[in-house]
């Protein structure tokens, strides 16, 4: 059979080889398509409800005014010329529809390095056959389930037109220290060969590098955190991230009811101020990061260095 590819909605003419160019003709067309359950016979004398789908032209060709999905199948013509010689024509018809240009929707403007991020959802509407969506990073194909790349796909079919809508959601984990402005794009590849891919406009989210935990530095003055009764301790939380995050303070794992500040001053230290202190840096777009904990203790006169253990208290510090 000769393979014919026709675009949905377009007309199609199938020639009946060996048929006399004008009536009277001895020919019949047989079709086995999505509109038939076995073979449907159409003849030149026909004319009827099938004409909206397929009709025999005066020259014996079969005319399909607007090819549809249900017209996929086999078309055969059997013709006899004036001398009684029989000729058969056999066609296998496949149909296609190219969708509109795919689009990336719900795209992220910023990604966080080191954690999974949704980049966006690629949508293609109105294809047949379904075809496929694929993602590209800086022009190179992204392979799902490799290097922190995952893709969630969904295919829906329109109940009336039979055309497909494809959706593909891309999740990536950008490497730390990688490209700060990667370029993502998505392309639709048709299900039938010989049709080029359609590509979306690219998106270029920023990659934000979160401050690693060890970079939230807690500096204690005096060093070591041991101080004589009535002395002063200054705790400074240093975060190199920009913009500066909010700094909250914890004592013995419990948040201190103080407004955010990078510096905590404990004046006139008493037993109630002893304990384990840490700071928590909270970035507007990211989760909290806690510093190492330091122990603040009171040195009784005649002691060297910090005492072992600490007593929790309810004393509050002063913010600088």
């Amino acid at each position: 059979a000769q393979n014919i590819t026709a675009r949905i909605g377009e007309p199609l003419v199938l020639k009946c080889k060996g048929a006399p160019k004008k009536p009277p003709q001895r020919l019949e067309w047989k079709l086995n398509t999505g509109r038939t359950e076995a073979w449907k016979v159409l003849s030149p004398q026909g004319g009827g409800p099938w004409d909206s789908v397929a009709r025999v032209l005066p020259n014996g060709s079969l005319f399909l005014p607007a090819v549809g999905i249900q017209d996929e199948g086999i078309f055969r013509c059997q013709a006899m010329n004036r001398n009684g010689k029989e000729t058969k024509s056999n066609y296998r018809v496949r149909v296609y529809q190219i969708p509109g240009k795919p689009e990336i929707v719900d795209s992220a403007s910023e990604l966080t390095a080191g954690v999974p991020n949704k980049v966006g959802t690629c949508v293609s509407e109105g294809s047949y056959p379904a075809g496929t969506l694929s993602w590209h990073l800086d022009g190179k194909p992204l392979v799902p389930n490799e290097k922190g790349v995952s893709v969630k796909e969904q295919t829906r079919r329109h109940p009336e037109t039979g055309l497909f809508t494809l959706q593909s959601e891309l999740m990536v984990t950008p490497a730390r220290g990688g490209d700060p402005r990667p370029t993502f794009s998505c392309s639709f590849s048709p299900g039938l060969p010989r049709h080029r891919a359609l590509r979306t406009a690219p998106i270029q989210p920023r990659v934000w590098e979160p401050v690693p935990l060890e970079e939230v530095q807690l500096v204690v003055e005096p060093e070591g955190g041991a101080v004589a009764p009535g002395g002063t301790v200054t705790l400074t939380c240093e975060v190199p991230a920009q913009p500066s995050p909010q700094i909250h303070w914890m004592k013995d794992g419990v948040p201190l009811p103080l407004p955010p500040s990078p510096v905590l001053i404990l004046p006139e230290i008493g037993p109630q101020d002893q304990g384990t202190y840490s700071c928590v840096a909270t970035h507007s777009s990211h989760g909290p990061q806690e510093s190492r904990a330091v122990s603040i203790s009171i040195i009784e006169p005649g002691e060297e260095g910090p005492t072992a253990g600490s007593v929790g208290g309810s004393g509050l510090g002063t913010l600088a």
């Epitope: 038939t36 449907k40 409800p49 099938w50 909206s52 789908v53």
Partner: antibody, heavy 119, light 107 residues
Framework: EVQLVESGGGLVQPGGSLRLSCAAS????????MTWVRQAPGKGLEWVAS????????YYPDSVKDRFTISRDNAKNSLYLQMNSLRAEDTAVYYC????????????WGQGTLVTVSS | DIQMTQSPSSLSASVGDRVTITCRAS??????VNWFQQKPGKAPRRLIY???NLADGVPSRFSGSRSGTDFTLTISSLQPEDFATYYC?????????FGGGTKVEIK
């Protein structure tokens, strides 16, 4: 909402003529074949004529061929049935219906208009 | 021409009954059969299209089936508003042919 409204029915003498109209709304008229169906008093349904969406091709049963002519004006969303040489047996309610091909069958009908052929 | 032989021509039934109406085509018409309901003085209303598909807005108690050239309309549980005349139509070939109708009456 699909609406089909017939008009033009009435009393006519045998041998006379009548023109029925059907005004269509609520759908893209030129995308559909259209059909006339009739029903004699107390009887069943009988196909009268069909026309394709462009108006280029028309179809009739032998009972009305050469006497009735179906036509359409896509600009006016209107369907017509010109009936000539009317006979007593043409007395019926005439319905306009959307469709008539294998894609649609007949899906929406008008309320009908009565044609009486009598002397 | 194709003949559509519809049976029975009339039947009496009660509310809640299961009702079956059949049309037999004189030759293969594929799936190209519609079923209609008509009440006195009203236009026909399509119930089933392409032999087995329920038209929009039609209650699910109506169903259509096909076996070769035999087509069946079934009403699973007859309701008071279902008392009417029912017609089949083949639209595979011209002339389009209707069945003779089945009048469903109250027993």
């Amino acid at each position: 909402e699909v609406q089909l409204v017939e008009s033009g029915g009435g009393l006519v003498q045998p041998g006379g003529s009548l023109r029925l109209s059907c005004a269509a709304s609520g759908f893209t008229f030129n995308n559909y074949w259209m059909t006339w169906v009739r029903q004699a008093p107390g009887k069943g349904l009988e196909w009268v004529a069909s026309i394709d969406n462009s108006g280029d091709n028309t179809y009739y049963p032998d009972s009305v061929k050469d006497r009735f002519t179906i036509s359409r004006d896509n600009a006016k969303n209107s369907l017509y049935l010109q009936m000539n040489s009317l006979r007593a047996e043409d007395t019926a309610v005439y319905y306009c219906a959307r469709g008539g091909d294998i894609v649609v069958g007949l899906d929406h009908w008008g309320q009908g208009t009565l044609v009486t052929v009598s002397s | 021409d194709i003949q559509m032989t519809q049976s029975p021509s009339s039947l009496s039934a009660s509310v809640g009954d299961r009702v079956t109406i059949t049309c037999r085509a004189s030759q293969d018409v594929g799936i190209y059969v519609n079923w209609f309901q008509q009440k006195p003085g009203k236009a026909p209303r399509r119930l089933i299209y392409r032999a087995t598909n329920l038209a929009d807005g039609v209650p699910s108690r109506f169903s259509g089936s096909r076996s070769g050239t035999d087509f069946t309309l079934t009403i699973s549980s007859l309701q008071p508003e279902d008392f009417a005349t029912y017609y089949c139509l083949e639209f595979d070939e011209h002339p389009l042919t209707f069945g003779g109708g089945t009048k469903v009456e109250i027993k």
